[in-house]
Interface confidence: low
């Protein structure tokens, strides 16, 4: 539909509250360093302008595109040049180049202070004093730290954040009520951000076709009773939604996501039997629920895939007539039969099938050539199965912290050029796959584990892209989206790496470590472990374990000492000397 005023159209569709929240998210995701008050001022100006357009769509500038209106507003920020440097050059460009330029300057690892949680009473007072500002600040702080956070989903998080404070600030024990809820929102938020980051990377780095293939596989697993045409329609609509959100078109994205949820609920009989509860919820909860809904049961008596995709004499004819449609059907049929496979595995199988048809349909006897194509799938299926089995056994043997340490050592040896904070963050997240997925039965382990690992490895890829230091990381990240995990798994110790110079300062610790939370103390120890491996990449597991055990004992001893700082200084020197001797540094 062509609307005389796009801004009026979206304001009317979304309502003032959601409109303002989404504009704030959009601005904070673009200008990540700007103070909160500046963003609120810009949002209020845009909102007032939108209201004039609702009143009269023919009013001056109301016919301008949202990118033009928002870009013009962002480019009024006085400190753009000194705060953002070359990003200010974007303002010299015309749309759509200007928006593309802003997108390219989004920073996955902005230099912002860590969010420190104030005392519960302080938070409750702030919440009661000005609820609207309190909630806007939440949107702003999350959006600027996560510039690809899925905006309509952030509205859902904000709704839960508000509900937590509304309930807990009047509870007898405010902290006992509130803190677990905030921890849960924080952890879920990080996971949601990382999942969306992979969707945006998929679209931006590998194109719409790659994203659509992912969506066909995932939706076919989730809705195995739906017809191929229905799945295709959902994939097209979902691709539009995510393309918009990843492109900074947050008002359109939220609007289209609401339309998609409405369509799914109106047509649930032909989509899935699991949607009933979701469809009874209000909009934000409904959309979230649909996105997380469990897989429907597979239809009984599905015929063998071989008939249509191997035995039929029309395989090459069907493939030649409409390659992507035929491959889409293959992916749909395979995925709906295999909820036990990861999406990336299904995509590898589809790629193998495509490669085989490309080769065989040009051969003298195509059928003879592709007759054994399904046999090629066996090793592709067994590789992740074996890897997950081995790693879950290791996780069960070691527990999460030590399993993370094993991965830290493994990945530091593979790609030692990567920064220590990135290696720690990524390896800790890789290690969480154990507690997240190993508890599941065999049939759910692979989709849980391998698709989660894809999300975590994408974090490594986007962080590395900002400051590329390793050809091996660049290679694994850019060659193939679906083969990233096998590519990293296949990496051996980097023999070309020149060990880092030993620096005693890196291994000097102070009494402040004693007041840290258990998680922060683990991160300190894991940081030291990465640095050790960078100094001594050929160190054995046993040598590293001995040094880390000594280190843990040293921290425990000094944290119990009366004069902690002196203990850290004196015992620290001894520890460094002993570690150097043990590792031959």
């Amino acid at each position: 539909d062509a609307h005389k005023s796009e801004v009026a159209h979206r304001f009317k569709d979304l309502g003032e509250e959601n409109f303002k929240a989404l504009v704030l998210i959009a601005f904070a995701q673009y200008l990540q360093q700007c103070p909160f008050e500046d963003h609120v001022k810009l949002v209020n100006e845009v909102t007032e302008f939108a209201k004039t357009c609702v009143a009269d769509e023919s009013a001056e500038n109301c016919d301008k595109s949202l990118h033009t209106l928002f870009g013009d507003k962002l480019c009024t920020v006085a400190t753009l040049r000194e705060t953002y440097g070359e990003m200010a050059d974007c303002c010299a460009k015309q749309e759509p180049e200007r928006n593309e330029c802003f997108l390219q300057h989004k920073d996955d690892n902005p230099n912002l202070p860590r969010l420190v949680r104030p005392e519960v009473d302080v938070m409750c007072t702030a919440f009661h004093d000005n609820e609207e500002t309190f909630l806007k600040k939440y949107l702003y702080e999350i959006a600027r730290r996560h510039p690809y956070f899925y905006a309509p989903e952030l509205l859902f998080f904000a709704k839960r954040y508000k509900a937590a404070f509304t309930e807990c600030c009047q509870a007898a024990d405010k902290a006992a009520c509130l803190l677990p809820k905030l921890d849960e929102l924080r952890d879920e938020g990080k996971a949601s951000s990382a999942k969306q980051r992979l969707k945006c990377a998929s679209l931006q780095k590998f194109g719409e076709r790659a994203f659509k293939a992912w969506a066909v596989a995932r939706l076919s697993q989730r809705f195995p009773k739906a017809e191929f045409a229905e799945v295709s329609k959902l994939v097209t609509d979902l691709t539009k939604v995510h393309t918009e959100c990843c492109h900074g078109d947050l008002l359109e994205c939220a609007d289209d996501r609401a339309d998609l949820a409405k369509y799914i609920c109106e047509n649930q009989d032909s989509i899935s039997s699991k949607l009933k509860e979701c469809c009874e919820k209000p909009l934000l909860e409904k959309s979230h629920c649909i996105a997380e809904v469990e897989n429907d049961e597979m239809p009984a008596d599905l015929p063998s895939l071989a008939a249509d995709f191997v035995e039929s004499k029309d395989v090459c004819k069907n493939y030649a007539e409409a390659k992507d449609v035929f491959l889409g059907m293959f992916l749909y049929e395979y995925a709906r039969r295999h909820p036990d496979y990861s999406v990336v595995l299904l995509l590898r199988l589809a790629k193998t099938y495509e490669t085989t048809l490309e080769k065989c349909c040009a051969a003298a006897d195509p059928h003879e050539c592709y007759a054994k194509v399904f046999d090629e799938f066996k090793p592709l299926v067994e590789e992740p199965q074996n890897l997950i089995k081995q790693n879950c056994e290791l996780f069960e043997q070691l527990g999460e912290y030590k399993f993370q340490n094993a991965l830290l050592v493994r990945y530091t040896k593979k790609v030692p050029q990567v920064s220590t904070p990135t290696l720690v963050e990524v390896s800790r997240n890789l290690g969480k796959v154990g507690s997240k997925c190993c508890k599941h039965p065999e049939a759910k382990r692979m989709p849980c584990a391998e698709d989660y690992l894809s999300v975590v490895l994408n974090q490594l890829c986007v962080l590395h892209e900002k400051t590329p230091v390793s050809d091996r990381v660049t290679k694994c990240c850019t060659e193939s989206l679906v083969n990233r995990r096998p590519c990293f798994s296949a990496l051996e110790v980097d023999e070309t790496y020149v060990p880092k110079e030993f620096n005693a300062e890196t291994f000097t610790f102070h009494a402040d470590i004693c007041t840290l939370s258990e998680k922060e103390r683990q991160i300190k120890k894991q940081t030291a472990l990465v640095e050790l491996v960078k100094h001594k990449p050929k160190a054995t597991k046993e040598q590293l374990k001995a040094v880390m055990d000594d280190f843990a004992a040293f921290v425990e001893k000094c944290c119990k000492a009366d004069d902690k700082e002196t203990c850290f200084a004196e015992e620290g020197k001894k520890l460094v000397a002993a570690s150097q001797a043990a590792l031959g540094l």
């Epitope: 780095k205 590998f206 194109g207 590329p468 660049t474 290679k475 850019t478 060659e479 193939s480």
Partner: nanobody, 115 residues
Framework: EVQLVESGGGLVQAGGSLRLSCAAS????????MSWVRQVPGKGPEWVSA????????RYAESIKGRFIISRDNAKKTLYLQMNSLKPEDTAVYYC????????GSQGTQVTVSS
């Protein structure tokens, strides 16, 4: 050792055409997506265009869509950029990169478009 050597740049009048080449060695060229990036002195690199490893999926920056065509010949280990309807604002050093990185790994080739 990974090497990328660009050629084909030069001085051309607005509206004219150039074809840039990038000869690759030291890695499995046919396994990598490739990009063209350009840089004006004093400014940051600007991504121009990308192509997947097989040459089937191509992407372009809005500023050059419809004017430039990216292609590759895996047998010759060469990446190409056909530049038509050149404008003065296309003046820059052009260089090719592996994947979609905008980090420079080569010398580049100068393209100057006069008005």
């Amino acid at each position: 050792e990974v090497q990328l050597v660009e050629s084909g740049g030069g001085l051309v009048q607005a509206g004219g055409s150039l074809r840039l080449s990038c000869a690759a060695s030291g890695f499995t060229f046919g396994s990598f997506g490739m990009s063209w990036v350009r840089q004006v002195p004093g400014k940051g690199p600007e991504w121009v265009s990308a192509i997947d490893s097989g040459g089937t999926d191509t992407r372009y920056a809005e500023s050059i869509k419809g004017r430039f065509i990216i292609s590759r010949d895996n047998a010759k280990k060469t990446l190409y950029l056909q530049m038509n309807s050149l404008k003065p604002e296309d003046t820059a050093v052009y260089y090719c990169t592996i994947g979609q990185s905008t980090s420079r790994g080569s010398q580049g080739t100068q393209v100057t478009v006069s008005s």
